[in-house]
């Protein structure tokens, strides 16, 4: 147990105010009650506390709710969220978008990242969803935060609100999360002509499958090299020659920068040299010439299958 | 279940001491605010005393403060009030109760034990 | 301190009839913190209403509360023959917790 302080007479705290930044760390200790800070949350932010009178005030509200901050306190931490942990936020149940609009203002230039992913984790578990309120509060308080959703939170997404989603809103999108939200994008923009489909799409393709870059590539879309190097990797590989270079129209000449990175690397090591040499761009690595191209995964599925056999 | 059972009432004389215990079980005591509430024969409630789980902070009501003392025991469960200097309007049962913060209410009471302050 | 002020006294009803029973604050109180106990001859007080309107585990549903502010009300939609006892109300901030006196609910 915290040794215990009594606190002096002439500093007990009846409301909280500003002559509580005069008082020591053990003095806050003592003489605020917890429920009276609870309930007087929307005070603290305006009284400039040091980040040590801050973390009393915090050990307060622990002490006080153990099982996790309401939301009627929540809502109102100002500064003091920065105090907080993910471990703590994971406690939390927060359905209103005014307190994530206003815990998301807060965490503003600081190095929030994690507490702001457990944040919006905790928004979506309150609400049920990812609904369109959610996405668009995020998107403009919040851009790239998308993505700092678990794929199992993406998973709840309507494919409704995918339209609300901006380009920029996906930068920071790995590949598992993409995974969930591809098949989304492509049902809310399935009535959309091919152009119009492509410019929508793009920016979710890094979750495609071959099938639907094939596809893609007999539209005439012109992808950008930036878009083909987000691709998955397993989806590039089996792409012909002849698909890359409709797919990427063009912007075909831009594999020779890229051929060194992944997944433009992985496909060449893949195609024969004589394929790439249609390119003309000087390509290098490929099967040569009177090769014999064995699919390894099918080589390893017939030998598995005598084994057991 | 939630458990709270008061202990150490009796007859006192004015100006005397008497320390009550509260044991508590059922919840994780170490967590929970923890309150004592007083009740004149054939009167109305009233609060004595508070104390936090941690930094055992402790709040009393003016009526009181100075002559008792709210502590707590987190190893053994145990809620205590130490009074001292009692007096014949101190006669009253003696409530342990358990301060949810989430409700802000007392939302569990022990039975209660009696004190008695009489020459 | 916050005085909290219950009306009437006495209530004598009838099983059955409905029951209102009120509690004035002398100051403003959020109702977050206004809580609502019954409590029976002999018996220590229970828990019924929190944060003014929530009914608290295990508290039939002929029980509400309401109000904010300076006013708040406990309502017994049909009293039962367990319901006659006394009420108080009660605020839990700022300190001191206060108590109102009390109000009797009896059998008319």
């Known amino acids: 147990d915290v040794e215990r302080t009594t606190c002096p007479p002439e500093k007990e705290v009846h409301e909280i105010d500003e002559s509580l930044i005069f008082y020591k760390k053990r003095e806050l200790e003592a003489c605020v009650d917890a429920a009276l800070l609870a309930a007087q949350m929307d005070r603290v932010d305006a009284i400039p506390f040091t980040y040590e009178q801050l973390d009393v005030l915090k050990h307060k509200l622990d002490e006080l709710y153990p099982q996790g901050y309401p939301e009627s306190v929540i809502r109102h931490l100002g500064h003091l969220f920065l105090k907080m942990s993910p471990e703590d936020i994971r406690k939390w149940n927060v359905t209103s978008l005014e307190t994530l609009k206003a815990l998301l203002k807060v965490s503003k230039g600081h190095e929030m990242s994690a507490q702001v992913a457990t944040l919006i984790d905790r928004v979506v578990v309150g609400r049920g969803q990812l609904d369109k309120d959610t996405a668009d509060t995020l998107t403009a308080f919040c851009p790239g935060c998308l993505c700092s959703l678990s794929p199992e939170r993406l998973s709840s997404v309507p494919p409704s609100i995918i339209g609300a989603v901006r380009p920029q809103d996906l930068d920071t999108c790995g590949p598992r999360q993409l995974d969930v939200l591809y098949p989304k994008a492509r049902l809310a923009f399935q009535n959309m002509s091919g152009s119009e489909y492509f410019v929508k799409i793009r920016p979710f393709l890094g979750g495609a499958p071959t099938e639907d870059l094939k596809a893609l590539s007999q539209q005439n879309v012109s992808m950008d090299l930036a878009t083909f190097m987000k691709l998955r990797r397993e989806a590039v590989l089996p792409l012909s020659v002849a698909e890359v270079q409709k797919l990427l129209g063009p912007h075909v000449e831009g594999l020779k920068v890229e051929e060194q990175h992944s997944p433009v690397r992985d496909w060449i090591l893949k195609q024969r040299q004589d394929d790439l040499d249609t390119l003309g761009l000087g390509l290098q690595g490929g099967i040569p010439n009177g090769y014999l191209i064995l699919d390894l995964s099918v080589r390893e599925a017939l030998s598995h299958h005598h084994h057991h056999h | 279940e939630v458990q709270l059972l008061e202990s150490g009432g009796g007859l006192v004389q004015p100006g005397g001491s008497l320390r009550l215990s509260c044991a508590a079980s059922?919840?994780?005591?170490?967590?929970?605010?923890m309150s004592w509430v007083r009740q004149a024969p054939g009167k109305g409630l009233e609060w004595v005393s508070n104390?936090?789980?941690?930094?055992?902070?402790?709040n009393y009501a003016d009526s009181v403060k100075g002559r008792f003392t709210i502590s707590r025991d987190n190893n053994k469960n145990t809620l205590y009030l130490q009074m001292n200097s009692l007096r014949a309007e101190d006669t009253a049962v003696y409530y342990c109760?358990?301060?949810?913060?989430?409700?802000?209410?007392?939302?569990?009471w022990g039975q209660g034990t009696l004190v008695t302050v009489s020459s | 301190e916050i005085v909290l002020t219950q009306s009437p006294g006495t209530l004598s009803l009838s099983p059955g009839e409905r029951a209102t029973l009120s509690c004035r604050a002398s100051?403003?109180?959020?109702?977050?913190?206004l809580a609502w106990y019954q409590q029976k001859p002999g018996q220590a007080p229970r828990l019924l209403i929190y944060?003014?309107?929530s009914r608290a585990t295990g508290i039939p549903d002929r029980f509400s509360g309401s109000g904010s502010g300076t006013d708040f009300t406990l309502t017994i939609s049909r009293l039962e023959p367990e319901d006659f006892a006394v009420y108080y109300c009660?605020?839990?901030?700022?300190?001191?917790?206060?108590f109102g006196q009390g109000t009797k609910v009896e059998i008319k």
């Open positions: 109760a358990r301060y949810n913060a989430y409700h802000a209410a007392l939302d569990y």
């Open positions: 059922g919840f994780t005591f170490t967590h929970t605010y």
């Open positions: 104390i936090s789980p941690t930094y055992s902070t402790t």
């Open positions: 100051q403003s109180v959020s109702s977050s913190y």
């Open positions: 944060g003014a309107s």
């Open positions: 009660q605020q839990t901030v700022p300190y001191p917790y206060t």
